[in-house]
């Protein structure tokens, strides 16, 4: 049967009608409305934006909107005491500082309540020391730095470029080194993509261009000050000192043209390869100090911000299914933002409105869909994905027993390419059907499908005549549901040539410069790459809440285990003695994945065959289906991160924003030969095959026939 | 259109003190670095003061170091050059001019400037 004749509608009110009512001259109405003024978290600006969302949701049509709200730990800087890094002399006598704002773009010269650029939860602190160049600050870096280098960290402020991974990463990475501050830069090599003007006159980043963000190390946990439970009115809050994933030394990033100042007087050891160097015109000498002429100067950081408990809101938007209201189906994406938010998060929100807004339409002419379709306004993601995991941490129970698929709505465009989708494999195939229906908005695939110019332009590595589908990592409000609860997710999103533009992110990422005029002077100007993405989110999420059988694949599980499987045993073979004294097998992580292969294959052709009229079977059939992300959770978690609990992804713990499979076993097997007791190392590397196995296992028999 | 225009000029004796304003129109003053630069009679350019975008550095020339100290009003589009134990030697035209490079660090080329104000040190 259609999905059609399942939730008892006319035709018309299909996926086509849906699609047909999203329309990109609204989407550029609400993201000119969106990104007008600043909607940092904890601010008067955001909660009047969320009661906006909540009444023009009301009015589209969803059957209630709600606001939630929670109080957690926000940082902000302090308003008379500003943020900065000076160079001084031996008397103490400060000779350069770095600016104290961005210089404001056309037409926001009088915009009150811009955030001038910080390290969001940086302590306070006023550190005074020799500076280190460490490059990206990845855990490489320091390993070349200390192990082949011999330079020493410790008491150094150390200086790193953006880029390549999570800057929560770089400040971990250097306080484990020793160091006493992170100054964190933007280099033209990482964000000023060769032959485009700095904005205003094109999209790269200007010298006095600066990326805020936030620096924790939550792993997971949410707000610092109640990891595991919401933070609502009776919440009991750890002390400071017990806060999860806060730094311990000052952080502060800069522009190019600051960066310059620093980097310029270096001393010390030349940079150890081409890698190290960046665009700027200076040495990019490693240190530790400044050369002959300066070297009785130093730096100093002046850090004065603060962190406070501040009330956020959500926006949680409910269209009631028709036939199994208690399945729940959640398109999610954040609403506040570092300053005007033109890519982050607005982009993303506009889209979400749009989908709203055709649901709605649909609503109102007498549709509803098969499942509870859920639609959230997240506050405080730049804060650490606070507002989306308070909300699962006060909705855990129903979540787990009711979540079908979450969908996350972040920023649309990261250029304007192609396609990039990361989501769990049991959504590959729902990706692909859909991208065949859709037309493809790029130049010279006029006619063609959306699947044909994104498998065009970015090819999957391993299957020809495929496109490329990344696995989830974090960084976005998606974390909580599928690291945590296991619930089926995905992303999808405009990006750049990866292969042309080697640049971090896009080059105006959390700058003031991120505006409306960005998006359409420079981006997108007939808003057609969001249309676009509209049409795959709000296609997903239209198939997910709406076909009689969820339209996940357990097959393609079994093919993803098999390739992880093979890479983990591949990274353990390149120590084979260790392997044979330690009695090291991948026998049942093989064996187990094998049997996943099979049950999934038979469950598939019952899935073919079965009696879909049957309301008791097909409730049966698709509880298997939507169970299954949830079997790969382990309760216990994975070592020292207990809120990520996915066993077969997790984020990799080099890089929050890259995903990592069997991340269990990759982390024990982790540098494992510099390691002092060995033969602990290798028994943790055996109970996490162990571990990895029984899941595997475990998971395949939640496939089988049940009785 | 974009403009500077100095103001605030005179005739002073030694050792008092001064301050001249520059009113920028057509452009917004929070976004760039600005210089004082004066020109004395007869002689060529001399270059006086130098302040970034945001305030937070002023460099000055060595011969009116601890006695000129250049200052903005970002919020009235204004430049000011408070000038104390002034000298003959100080007697010039002062002209305010716009640094070149959006939200640079340093002092760098101009490329604008105004029509100039008259300061005499004289007894």
């Known amino acids: 049967k259609s999905s059609n004749e399942a939730t008892n509608i006319t035709p018309k009110h299909n996926m086509k009608a849906f699609l047909d009512e999203l329309k990109a001259e609204n989407i550029k109405k609400f993201l000119y409305n969106f990104t007008q003024i600043p909607h940092l978290a904890g601010t008067e600006q955001n909660f009047q934006l969320a009661k906006q969302i909540q009444s023009q949701w009301k009015e589209f049509g969803l059957d209630s909107v709600e606001l939630a709200h929670y109080d957690v730990l926000l940082s902000y800087p302090n308003k008379t005491h500003p943020n900065y890094i000076s160079i001084i002399n031996e008397d103490g006598n400060e000779i350069f500082n770095t600016s104290l704002f961005e210089p404001p773009p056309p037409g926001y010269e009088n915009v009150s309540d811009i955030v001038p650029p910080f390290s969001a939860f940086s302590p306070q602190g006023m550190p005074e020391g020799d500076l280190v160049y460490v490059n990206y600050a990845r855990t490489e870096d320091f390993f070349k730095l200390e192990r082949d280098m011999k330079i020493n960290c410790s008491g150094k402020i150390v200086i790193a470029r953006y880029g390549k991974v999570f800057r929560g990463n770089k400040v971990k990475n250097a306080q484990l080194a020793g160091a006493k501050g992170v100054i964190l830069y933007s280099d033209p090599a990482d964000y000023f993509a060769p032959g485009v003007k700095s904005y205003p006159d094109g999209w790269n980043l200007p010298g006095g261009g600066v990326q805020r963000g936030n620096i924790l190390n939550l792993n997971g946990a949410g707000d610092p000050l109640t990891p595991g439970y919401p933070a609502n009115e009776y919440a009991y809050r750890r002390g400071i000192a017990e806060a999860v994933g806060l730094p311990s030394i000052p952080v502060h990033p800069i522009g190019y043209y600051d960066a310059q100042k620093l980097l310029e007087k270096m001393g010390g050891s030349a940079p150890p390869d081409s890698s190290w160097r960046g665009s700027l015109k200076v040495p990019y000498n490693v240190g530790p100090g400044f050369t002959g002429n300066f070297s009785t100067q130093k730096v100093k950081m002046h850090i004065h911000s603060t962190n406070e408990v501040t009330r956020i809101y959500n926006v949680i938007g409910t269209l009631r299914g028709a036939v199994e209201p208690d399945r729940y189906v959640i398109l999610g994406g954040h609403r506040d933002s570092w300053v005007f938010g033109g890519i982050d998060p607005q982009s993303g929100a506009a889209v979400v409105h749009e989908i709203v807004r055709s649901f709605g339409t649909l609503k109102k002419e007498g549709w509803r869909p098969r499942r509870t379709i859920l639609f959230a306004s997240w506050d405080a993601e730049e804060f650490g994905l606070l507002g989306s995991t308070e909300w699962a941490e006060e909705n855990s129970r129903l979540l787990q027993e009711r979540g079908v698929a979450y969908i996350n709505a972040d920023s649309s465009i990261e250029g304007n390419y192609t396609l990039r989708v990361d989501c769990t494999p049991l959504m590959y195939s729902l990706v692909h059907n859909l991208t065949k229906e859709l037309k493809s908005p790029d130049e010279g695939f006029e006619g063609k499908s959306l699947y044909e110019s994104w498998t065009k332009k970015s090819p999957s590595p391993e299957f020809s005549g495929m496109p490329r589908i990344s696995k989830l990592g974090s960084g976005n409000d998606f974390e909580v549901f599928f690291q945590r609860l296991g619930i089926a997710s995905g992303r999808a999103r405009y990006t750049k040539n990866w292969e042309t533009n080697k640049f971090s992110g896009y080059p105006l990422y959390h700058s003031v410069y991120e505006t409306y005029e960005l998006v359409e002077k420079f981006y997108d100007p007939m808003f057609k790459y969001h249309l676009t993405v509209a049409q795959v989110r709000g296609g997903m999420v239209f198939e997910l809440a709406n076909s009689i059988v969820l339209p996940f694949d357990c097959r393609d599980y079994a093919v993803v285990l098999r390739k992880y499987a093979d890479k983990i045993y591949s990274i353990s073979m390149k120590h084979p003695q260790e392997m044979k004294t330690y009695s090291v097998s991948f026998d049942s992580l093989f064996s187990a994945v094998k049997n996943f292969t099979e049950i999934a294959s038979k469950f598939s052709e019952r899935l073919q065959d079965f009696d879909k009229s049957n309301p008791i079977v097909l409730r049966m059939m698709n509880d298997q289906l939507m169970f299954l992300e949830r079997a790969f959770i382990d309760p216990l978690g994975l070592p020292d991160r207990p809120f990520y609990r996915h066993v077969i992804y997790a984020p990799s713990s080099h890089n929050k924003y890259a995903g990592e499979s069997f991340p269990g076993i990759y982390d024990a097997l982790f540098d494992i030969e510099s390691k002092v007791d060995p033969s602990k190392a290798w028994g943790e590397v055996k109970r996490q095959i162990y571990v990895a196995a029984f899941t595997v296992q475990a998971a395949a028999e939640t496939l089988s026939e049940v009785a | 259109q974009v403009q500077l225009v100095e103001s605030g000029g005179g005739v002073v004796q030694p050792g008092r003190s001064l301050r001249l304003s520059c009113a920028a129109s057509?452009?917004?003053?929070?976004?760039?670095?600005m210089h004082w630069v004066r020109q004395a009679p007869g002689k060529g350019l001399e270059w006086v003061a130098f302040q970034t975008y945001d305030g937070s550095n002023r460099y000055y020339a060595d011969s009116v170091k601890g006695r000129f100290t250049i200052s903005r009003d970002n919020s009235k589009n204004t430049l000011y050059l408070q000038m104390n134990s002034l000298r003959a030697e100080d007697t010039a035209v002062y002209y305010c001019?716009?640094?070149?490079?959006?939200?640079?660090?340093?002092?760098?080329?101009?490329?604008?400037w105004g029509q100039g104000t008259m300061v005499t040190v004289s007894s």
């Open positions: 057509g452009f917004p003053l929070i976004s760039y670095g």
């Open positions: 001019a716009r640094d070149r490079i959006v939200g640079g660090r340093v002092p760098d080329a101009f490329d604008i």
